[in-house]
């Protein structure tokens, strides 16, 4: 008789999981020479264990402190950048600007990105069928609870300057229920930071407003003034030309706006 | 975190030259605009010269084109203004500042930079 399986209302778990899982981490550690002492089928088998045979709806940020003590890494505290609804161009710009690093570019970060995953309670089975949905079935969701987790100690590592990269093409500029405003924003250690520097990507060509006047960003700056860390804001007027001009600063094109 | 800090400020006499240096010290990425303001006693700031991200693109106040250069160099973390034909009506002091973006669409308005130096002062006497 087939077992009844519970019906969540995400996607579920992609496809050849623990194979992605595992051949990221060893490619990973491959490139990184700090992180080549990493046992990876200790790292994967400290992630499955975060999530399998447990509610996915009942994940805590304990069930990931094995994983998260095998992928400790150290990254220079002044070279961290966030990002906020505006993923790609983040980490278009670290692969260029390759002193910077989003937590993409750590091996944690690198391991989940762009993945889903979710087990079921009292089976070892991963459930590739569905997975729950933050808003419709539950925030304590293997996923959430992942990137929280990695989220809070990347923003608790931060010093000096750190830099958030906003979508300026959204209503929400800064948006108080993303990973950065409601994470990241309030795991900033003021004794340890200096100023959060907000770069706003403008969307249209033809866009010249002071985007850094906006609403949201002055609630951003609210928010940071009042944990005592400076607040700086920044226009990226043409973000294509931008990576451009970073990638090659000698370039022609790179002597009007960007 | 990002200091902007002025130095080359001083006393000389009318038509000589000064070279003003401001370092911008703390940054890991120099892709913004910089400028260079002054503020005469009891006065508002005033725009003085700019220069783009990458230094290729200059703007100059009419008070100071023909006589002051501006530049930078991104790898030292330095901006110059180079001041030539000094008038005692350029006596004030003078700050460097970060622009909120790349290029000079800005340059000129005070709201368009977040980041300011101390100031130096230039006094030059007829």
């Known amino acids: 008789v087939p077992r009844w399986r519970q019906q969540w209302s995400g996607p579920g778990t992609t496809k050849r999981f623990p194979e992605t899982v595992l051949a990221r981490c060893v490619k990973y550690t491959e490139i990184h020479p700090e992180m080549r002492h990493v046992d990876c089928q200790s790292v994967w088998d400290a992630f499955k264990g975060a999530f399998i045979s447990k509610h996915p709806c009942n994940i805590t940020e304990e069930d990931y402190q094995p994983l998260m003590k095998l992928g400790t890494q150290t990254v220079p505290c002044n070279k961290i950048l966030l990002w906020s609804r505006i993923k790609d161009l983040a980490h278009q710009f670290t692969q260029v600007q390759r002193d910077m690093f989003t937590l993409e570019d750590t091996l944690l970060g690198y391991l989940a990105d762009d993945l889903t995953w979710c087990g079921e309670f009292n089976t070892s089975k991963i459930n590739y069928q569905s997975c729950p949905d933050w808003r419709k079935d539950c925030s304590n969701n293997p996923v959430s609870v992942f990137w929280k987790t990695v989220s809070r100690r990347f923003a608790e590592a931060a010093c000096d300057v750190v830099h958030v990269m906003l979508n300026g093409s959204r209503s929400k500029i800064f948006d108080k229920n993303s990973t950065f405003g409601s994470v990241e924003v309030h795991n900033l250690q003021p004794e340890k930071v200096q100023t959060l520097e907000a770069w706003v990507i403008h969307g249209g060509r033809e866009d010249s407003r002071d985007l850094c006047q906006d609403p949201t960003i002055k609630e951003l700056e609210s928010i940071i003034s009042k944990r005592n860390i400076q607040f700086s804001c920044k226009n990226i007027y043409r973000p294509d030309k931008f990576l451009q001009c970073v990638k090659n600063p000698e370039d022609s094109s790179c002597t009007s706006e960007i | 975190d990002v200091q902007l800090q002025e130095s080359g400020g001083g006393l000389v006499q009318a038509g000589d030259s000064l070279r003003l240096s401001c370092e911008f010290s703390?940054?890991?990425?120099?892709?913004?605009?910089m400028g260079w303001f002054r503020q005469f006693p009891g006065k508002e700031r005033e725009f003085v010269a700019a220069?783009?991200?990458?230094?290729?693109?200059?703007d100059y106040s009419d008070s100071v084109k023909g006589r002051f250069t501006i530049s930078r160099d991104n790898v030292k973390q330095m901006m110059y203004l180079a001041m030539n034909s000094l008038k005692p009506e350029d006596t004030a002091v003078y700050f460097c500042?970060?622009?909120?973006?790349?290029?000079?669409?800005?340059?000129?308005?005070?709201?368009?930079?977040?980041?300011w130096g101390r100031g130096t002062q230039v006094t030059v006497s007829s």
């Open positions: 500042a970060e622009a909120r973006s790349a290029g000079l669409g800005s340059s000129r308005r005070i709201e368009g930079y977040d980041k």
């Open positions: 703390g940054r890991t990425f120099s892709g913004f605009a």
């Open positions: 220069i783009n991200w990458s230094g290729s693109d200059t």
